[in-house]
Structure formats: C-alpha cells, structure tokens
C-alpha cells in the first residue's frame, strides 16, 4: 500500500482542517488508514483522524482543532496499521479556505432597489471576521448568458443594486462566497443560492 498523491490540507481558520490524498489503489480509508496530527507546541496532545473514502482510491480527513493562531504548525503522520506511509507538516494559516457565508436573503421591498444581505461565517473573536470580502453571483434562470459577479470589497455583508439593472418579470438566483486577502486565501465554497422574482416599475417614457 502506497500513497500516490500526498495529503494536501486546507483550514477554515476556526475549527476544521480538511486533508485529501490518493492511494495507489482502491482503499477502505476508514478501516485501513489513520492520520495522526499534533500541534508543534509544548504539552499539545496527538489526535487521530479516521479518514473517509473520497472516490475509489481517494481519502479525506476532517481534522478537529480547538482554535487556530497564525504561528500554528502541525505534524502529520499517515499510518496503515504499524506502517508509516507518509510524514509531513501543515501550517493552517498558509492554507486557508474560508467558511461559506450563510443566510443569503434578497430584500425586494426597498423602492426599486435590491438589497442582498448574508451572514459572516465567523464569530467576532475570530481574526477572519474583520478581513473577509465577498463576491456575489447573480444569474437568470431563463437566460444562461445573464450571469454577473459583483465584488464586495467593503466589510459589510450586504450589496445594493438597482432592480432595473436586471430584467423585469423574470426569476433570478443569487449566491455569495468569501475570501480574505490578509492570508491570501482561496475562495470559500458558494453559499446556498436564493431565488426571487424581479419586478419593478418601468419609468414612463416622455414623448
């Protein structure tokens, strides 16, 4: 049994890091493998992660972490029984994938303005709470070409757009994702999408 693709890990910079790897053949990850991880810090205990299958030869492990600070570094040992298959390390702050925003809501009752709001996925005491920026994706269910991205570079989790920038009388969907420049993170997954019917009063044409 050998590792074909070495583990790569990403952290949500809160409580979970996810590591994925591939074996050289079909593997029952949960019965055959264990991923041991330990913070390089005095008196930190080693923890064991039981991996799950992720495709035939792929494995994924969700490492639980009490908290994360930027200096943290973990040793990782992948074991098959008594055999050490791979040894490495992982610094969560250098491989951050933020949590996806939640509670995306479209408020359509504000005088021909669409107000989109969502929730920051981090608690106020987490470093990323004040460092997230967002991308909002809006698309038409009727017209695949009607697809747009709004970059929200301020901290407030909201976006205002004129309803008239979208077509009237048709349904739209929106979703939002996050990233943090300070840690050069990857983008989060998209939030679940929300749907609304766009309608607004056309201005009277003057002849």
């Amino acid at each position: 049994m050998k590792v074909l693709q070495e583990p790569t890990c990403v952290s949500d910079y809160m409580s979970i890091s996810t590591c994925e790897w591939k074996m050289n053949g079909p593997t029952n990850c949960s019965t055959e493998l264990r991923l041991l991880y330990q913070l390089v810090f005095l008196l930190s205990e080693a923890h064991t992660c039981i991996p799950e299958n992720n495709g035939g030869a792929g494995c994924v492990c969700h490492l639980l972490m009490d908290d994360v600070v930027s200096a943290d570094n973990y040793t990782l040992d992948l074991w098959a029984g008594q055999q050490l298959l791979w040894k490495g390390s992982f610094k969560p702050s250098e491989h951050v994938k933020p949590r996806a925003p939640g509670n995306l809501t479209v408020h359509t009752n504000v005088s021909d303005t669409l107000l989109l709001t969502w929730s920051n996925p981090y608690p106020p005491d987490n470093y990323l709470y004040n460092h997230l920026t967002y991308a909002v994706n809006i698309w038409s269910e009727n017209d695949p070409a009607d697809f747009r991205i709004y970059n929200v570079t301020y901290l407030e989790p909201s976006l205002r757009i004129a309803a008239s920038t979208l077509k009237s009388g048709i349904s739209y969907r929106a979703r939002v994702r996050a990233w943090a420049q300070c840690y050069n993170t990857t983008w989060s997954e998209w939030s679940p999408s929300t749907k609304w019917h766009n309608s607004y009063r056309e201005p009277f044409e003057q002849h």
């Epitope: 810090f41 005095l42 008196l43 205990e45 009490d66 908290d67 600070v69 930027s70 200096a71 570094n73």
Partner: antibody
Framework: QLQLVESGGGLVQPGGSLRLSCAAS????????MSWVRQAPGKGLEWVSG????????AYADSVKGRFTISRDNAKNTLYLQMNSLKPDDTAVYYC??????????WGQGTQVTVSS | QTVVTQEPSLSVSPGGTVTLTCGLS?????????PGWYQQTPGQAPRSLIY???SRHSGVPSRYSGSISGNKATLTITGAEPEDEADYYC????????FGGGTKLTVL
Amino acid sequence: QLQLVESGGGLVQPGGSLRLSCAASGFTFSSYIMSWVRQAPGKGLEWVSGISSGGGITAYADSVKGRFTISRDNAKNTLYLQMNSLKPDDTAVYYCVAGLLRVEGYWGQGTQVTVSS
Amino acid sequence: QTVVTQEPSLSVSPGGTVTLTCGLSSGSVTSSNYPGWYQQTPGQAPRSLIYATASRHSGVPSRYSGSISGNKATLTITGAEPEDEADYYCALHKGTYVFGGGTKLTVL
C-alpha cells in the same frame, strides 16, 4: 465568571513535602493546558511545570525535575502540584495558570510556599 | 540554556508611547515562539495582556499592542496612563515556557 483558586501552601521544613491544589470554575477546564508558575520574593516569574489538556503529557523546569509532580482531575476541575524534597530556593508564591502563550491566559491569585527550618 | 532578555527598567510620560522588547540571548524571536506579555502591579497576581505575538486578551485596552520587530517581540503602550506603571514580563515558547526577567515601567 472564570476563577482559579490555589490552596495548600504553607510553611514546610527543607526536605519536606506539600501538595498544592487549584480549583477551576467558569470555563472548560478540560480544554486547557495548565501550568504552575512561581515567583520568589522580589524576583521575576518562573515557569515550573505544565500538563496537557487530557493529562497525558507533562513537562517540568530543570530546577524541579524529579522532585515535583503535576497532575489534574478533569472530572473535579482541579490541578495539582505534588512537591517533594523541598529546598529553601523553592520559597515563592505559586500561581496556577490556564493557557499560557497560545491562547488567552488566566491566572489565579497564588498561594505562598515557604521552605525554612 | 535559553535566556529571555528584557530591559530592566523604562519610563514614559503620561500620554506618551513606550516600547518594551523581548529577545533571546542567542537567535531571533519569531511567531513560532508565541510571545506573550504579562502585567503585574505590586501585591497582585500577573494578568495576561497579549498572547501569540499580537492577540489582545479580552478586557485589555487597545493602547496595548504586540508585534515582532527585527529579532525581538515588542509590547507597545500608546498613550500611557498612570495605572500602566507596573512590572511587565514576556514569555516565549522555546522547548519549554521561558519568562524574561521583567521590565519595571515608570509613568512620570
């Protein structure tokens, strides 16, 4: 409200023993690395010993190795320090500390240990 | 034997800014040393100010800030107040936890 209350200090003769206790409340004791830190009269702070959150790993300053034993009872939210073969140099205020350096740290008010004949 | 170095004493005028440093007798302080800062006033137990280089303990005023500058950890007090007069200790993760000798800060 978070609290750490040390007890068990006192006056002891050189070569004698004492057992310090630290009762914790107001936080999840079992999640914290715990330490004992001491301060001799008119001197600075010295880390003495520490124990992992689950109690499986311990560490000691060279000055107390082989004489002091740290332990914890997570069911009772209590930290202990068994001190044997005490020397006059061990005279100090002993503080119980939750979470040094890496997370928010909380200190007890301390208990006085005096080693004198 | 790891020795953590601090200025024995410093003074600052009320409203002024002062920077305390925390170094190693050999080598540089990095974030992997998780520098922490502790304040102690006479007759009181120490209290935590800064942990993991720059994170402020809850309840600590924003005039206290921690960082690493050059090869040392630093604690900066901006807009010093009379109640900031105290002993300040740094500690580093270096095999074990090692405290510095402390800095006596006078506000005058």
